[in-house]
């Protein structure tokens, strides 16, 4: 089986050939808070199966196929940066302060 | 239970079109990721596309651009419009649901008995 935050593209009898990253970010994707800059930060990582397994930039990820026409993939690596969280120990994120 | 059944397949010829649909039954698409995989004979399984409960999309690149995946959650219906089929795209097709979740056997997700699709050139 593939690891958390990957997806079985190619698979064979009762094995997965190809692991990708998963290709579409969860709506619990974290987002930077505005003082990480300023000081170290501890995320905990959230019980298993609320995990964002994510790809957060996909290549060939889309807008919604749907009505609603507010909503938009485009990512601003400056003002708001997802992060994927790993599903078994807690991650610390330290900051140089640039 | 969750049950999918999909249906819209045919034999059609190289550059035509079709819509595939899979309807659910046991849960509704305002929860898990769905997604589309095919199977041709004596071959692996190939994830066709995937999309989220809101509405965001993703294609593998050999479909990219001749393939739609569209969501009704108010008729528990996903579809994926074919177009511009080639005969490498004849295949049978499933719809998974949350296929992050669930992967056992060809291919991945709680899946239906899958839809032929069978392009000739």
């Known amino acids: 089986e593939c690891r958390p935050g990957m997806i079985c593209a190619t698979s064979a009898t009762n094995s997965c050939a190809r692991c990708v990253p998963y290709p579409i970010c969860a709506a619990e994707t974290v987002t930077k808070p505005q003082d990480m800059a300023e000081k170290d930060t501890t995320f905990e990582a959230p019980p298993l199966g609320t995990q964002p397994d994510c790809n957060p930039t996909p290549e060939n990820g889309e807008a919604p196929a749907s009505t609603s026409p507010t909503q938009s993939l485009l990512v601003d690596s400056q003002a708001s940066k997802t992060l994927p969280i790993p599903t078994s120990a807690p991650v610390a994120l330290s900051s140089t302060g640039k | 239970q969750v049950q999918l059944v999909e249906s819209g397949g045919g034999s059609v010829q190289a550059g035509e079109t079709l819509r595939l649909s899979c309807t659910a039954s046991?849960?509704?698409?305002?929860?898990?990721?769905m997604a589309w995989y095919r199977q041709a004979p004596g071959n692996e399984c190939e994830l066709v596309s995937i999309?989220?409960?809101?509405?965001?999309?993703y294609y593998t690149d050999s479909v990219k651009g001749r393939f739609t995946a569209s969501q009704d959650n108010a008729k528990n219906t996903v579809s994926l419009y074919l177009k511009s089929l080639q005969p490498e795209d004849t295949a049978v097709y499933y719809c998974?649901?949350?296929?992050?979740?669930?992967?056992?056997?060809?291919?991945?997700?709680?899946w239906g008995p899958g839809t032929q699709v069978t392009v000739s050139s």
């Open positions: 998974a649901a949350d296929p992050r979740r669930n992967c056992r056997g060809n291919c991945c997700g709680n």
């Open positions: 046991g849960f509704t698409f305002d929860g898990p990721d």
């Open positions: 999309i989220s409960a809101d509405g965001r999309t």
